[in-house]
C-alpha cells in the first residue's frame, strides 16, 4: 500500500548501556473526532464524507505493523521478521535496546472499511542511540519500585536530572492509556496501591531549527511490600525422622518460605552430617513453586539413588538463609519395619 499519505511522527530512544530497557511504539491512529487527517489527501475542505470518519481506533487490537527497510525494499510484516519485537494490541514492544532498532515503523488498521481508510496510517521514524552524556550519572531507572501503602513517585528517566522548573511538558501513558492530568517529569503518588503497577511511558518534545521529535522513555513500575524482617521458614520436611526402605531410591524435598526482599539472594541447600563430618550435597537446582507479593516458596530436593545402611546413621540437613538469618531442619532416616 502507498505510505505517502501516512501521518509521520519522529521518535528518539536514548538507551542506557548499563541497564535492561524496553521501548514501545503506540499506533497513534487518530480518534474518530480528530481523524480528518486520514482523508486530507482525498477530500477538499468542501467535500463531506457520506460515512463516519475512520472508526478503526475503537478496536486498536486490529492493527498491522510493518517495518520499512532502508534500502527501499517492500514493507516487512513485523511479526514475521523481528522476534525481539512483540505486538500487543496496538502497541509494539521492543524487548532489547540497540541502534539496530532504528528505522521506520508503519501501522494501519487490518480492516479497511472504505477507500478513505487506505490512507489511515501512521509512520514512526525511530532513532535509537546509546546514552553518551555522563553528566547525569544518577538518572532514574527504567525499573522503579513503589512501596505499597506509602507515598512514592515515578520519574521520567530521560528528564530525571532536570529540575521541575526547567523540565518541558511531559505526556505520560500507563499501560498504553493517556494520563491526561500528568504533565511534569515526575508523577507523585500520594498512596501506593497495587493498581499503580504497570508500564509507564513518558514523552516530551525536543526541537532544533530544522525539525522536532518526541523523546520517549519506558518505565516498568512494580508495587512492592517492605523488605521482610524475618528469616526463612521451613515448611517441609516437618518431621525430623523419615521411615525408608533399604535399597530403594529416596527423594527428600525441602520447601521454604522466603519473605520479600528487594535484593533477593535466597539460599536453600542440603548437607549431610555423619559423626563429626559434614558436607554439602550437590543436588538439583532449587525452583520457585509459589510466588506472591509478600513471599516466595522455594523447593530443593535431595535424591538418593538407593538408601544404604550408612544413610541410616547420617543426618540430612536442609539449610535455608536470607539476609536476616537462617533456619535448618534435619532429617534422620529410619528403616521401615515389617
Amino acid at each position: 500500500f502507498n505510505i505517502s499519505g501516512c501521518s509521520t511522527k519522529k521518535l528518539l530512544w536514548t538507551y542506557s548501556t548499563r541497564s535492561e530497557e524496553e521501548f514501545v511504539l503506540f499506533c497513534d491512529l487518530p480518534e474518530p473526532q480528530k481523524s480528518h487527517f486520514c482523508h486530507r489527501n482525498r477530500l477538499s475542505p468542501k467535500q463531506v464524507p457520506e460515512h463516519l470518519p475512520f472508526m478503526g481506533s475503537n478496536d486498536l487490537s486490529d492493527v498491522q505493523w510493518y517495518q520499512q527497510p532502508s534500502n527501499g525494499d517492500p514493507l516487512e510484516d513485523i511479526r514475521k521478521s523481528y522476534p525481539h519485537i512483540i505486538q500487543d494490541k496496538c502497541t509494539l514492544h521492543f524487548l532489547t535496546p540497540g541502534v539496530n532498532n532504528s528505522g521506520s515503523y508503519i501501522c494501519r488498521p487490518k480492516m479497511i472499511k472504505s477507500p478513505y481508510d487506505v490512507a489511515c496510517c501512521v509512520k514512526m521514524i525511530l532513532e535509537v542511540k546509546p546514552q553518551t552524556n555522563a553528566s547525569c550519572e544518577y538518572s532514574a531507572s527504567h525499573k522503579q519500585d513503589l512501596l505499597l501503602g506509602s507515598t512514592g513517585s515515578i520519574s521520567c528517566p530521560s528528564l530525571s536530572c532536570q529540575s521541575d522548573a526547567q523540565s518541558p511538558a511531559v505526556t505520560w501513558y500507563k499501560n498504553g492509556k493517556l494520563l491526561s492530568v500528568e504533565r511534569s517529569n515526575r508523577i507523585v503518588v500520594d498512596e501506593v496501591y497495587d493498581y499503580h503497577q504497570g508500564t509507564y511511558v513518558c514523552d516530551y518534545t525536543q526541537s532544533d531549527t530544522v525539525s522536532s521529535w518526541t523523546v520517549r522513555a519506558v518505565v516498568q513500575v512494580r508495587t512492592i511490600v517492605g523488605d521482610t524482617k524475618l528469616k526463612p521458614d521451613i515448611l517441609d520436611p516437618v518431621e525430623d525422622t523419615l521411615e525408608v526402605e533399604l535399597g530403594k531410591p529416596l527423594t527428600i524435598s525441602c520447601k521454604a518460605r522466603f519473605g520479600f526482599e528487594r535484593v533477593f539472594n535466597p539460599v536453600i541447600k542440603w548437607y549431610i552430617k555423619d559423626s563429626d563430618l559434614e558436607w554439602e550435597v550437590s543436588v538439583p537446582e532449587a525452583k520457585s513453586i509459589k510466588s506472591t507479593l509478600k513471599d516466595e516458596i522455594i523447593e530443593r530436593n535431595i535424591i538418593l539413588e538407593k538408601v544404604t545402611q550408612r544413610d541410616l546413621r547420617r543426618k540430612f540437613v536442609c539449610f535455608v538463609q536470607n539476609s536476616i538469618g537462617n533456619t535448618t531442619q534435619s532429617v534422620q532416616l529410619k528403616e521401615k519395619r515389617g
Partner: antibody, heavy 117, light 110 residues
C-alpha cells in the same frame, strides 16, 4: 479470630472431629496448631498444619489424631478417643514468626471433649 | 527434645506485690522463649516473646529476662486481674520438633 467447635461427650472409640474456624487472616499465610489441656492440668501440644498442608504431630499424638484444613477451617480428627483424651482442645494460630521466634497467637476459647462410657 | 521445667508450681502474693516465676530449659535455647497467661476458664494469651519482648497490648508490669537455659518472668505491682496460670514455651523451632510448654505456675493474688 479463632473459634473451636464440635466438642461433646463421646463414648471411647467413637471418632470425633473438632473444627477451628478462622476469620481476619488467611490460612494460606499461617500455620495452625492444636493444643489440649486436661482438667486441672497443663498445656499439651498436639501438632500443626502449615501453609502447604504439611502436618506435624508430637510423638504421643501420631496415629491418634489427624489434622486437615479447608480455606477457612482447620479440623482435628480424634480417630479412636480414650478416656485419657478428655480435655479442652484449643486451636491457635502458629507456630509463626514474631521477631524470628515461633509463637502461638491468638488462641480460640477452646472446646471441651469428654470421653466416657 | 527440650524439656521446660517451671518453678514454683504455685505462688501467692498480695496486691501491689511482686512475683517471680522461673523456667529452666534442659539445653540452651538462646533467647527463644515465650510466656503465656491463662486465666481460669479462658484460653492462653501471649505475654512475652524472645525472652523479654512484650506482646502487643501487654502491661509493662510484666517483665521477661534470661538467656541460655535460665529464664524469669517478673510481675510487679500485682493486681487482682493477674491471678492466672503462667506457662513458658520454648519457641525455637527449625521446622519440626515438639513445642514444649513448661508445667505452669499458678499465681494467687491475695
Amino acid at each position: 479470630s479463632v473459634e473451636e467447635s464440635g466438642g461433646r461427650l463421646v463414648a471411647p472409640g467413637t471418632p470425633l472431629t473438632l473444627t477451628c474456624t478462622v476469620s481476619g487472616f488467611s490460612l494460606s499465610n499461617y500455620a495452625m496448631s492444636w493444643v489440649r489441656q486436661a482438667p486441672g492440668k497443663g498445656l499439651e501440644y498436639i501438632g500443626f498444619i502449615n501453609i502447604i498442608d504439611s502436618t506435624y504431630y508430637t510423638n504421643w499424638a501420631k496415629g491418634r489424631f489427624t489434622i486437615s484444613k479447608t480455606s477457612t477451617t482447620v479440623d482435628l480428627k480424634m480417630t479412636s478417643p480414650t478416656t485419657e483424651d478428655t480435655a479442652t482442645y484449643f486451636c491457635a494460630r502458629g507456630p509463626y514468626y514474631v521477631n524470628n521466634e515461633n509463637v502461638f497467637d491468638p488462641w480460640g476459647p477452646g472446646t471441651l471433649v469428654t470421653v466416657s462410657s | 527434645d527440650v524439656v521446660m521445667t517451671q518453678t514454683p508450681a504455685s505462688v501467692s502474693a498480695a496486691v501491689g506485690g511482686t512475683v517471680t516465676i522461673k523456667c529452666q530449659a534442659s539445653q540452651s535455647i538462646g533467647s527463644s522463649l515465650a510466656w503465656y497467661q491463662q486465666k481460669p476458664g479462658q484460653s492462653p494469651k501471649l505475654l512475652i516473646y524472645s525472652a523479654s519482648n512484650l506482646a502487643s497490648g501487654v502491661s509493662s508490669r510484666f517483665k521477661g529476662s534470661g538467656s541460655g537455659t535460665e529464664y524469669t518472668l517478673t510481675i510487679s505491682d500485682l493486681e487482682c486481674a493477674d491471678a492466672a496460670t503462667y506457662y513458658c514455651q520454648c519457641t525455637y523451632y527449625g521446622g519440626s520438633g515438639d513445642v514444649p510448654f513448661g508445667g505452669g505456675t499458678e499465681v494467687v493474688v491475695k
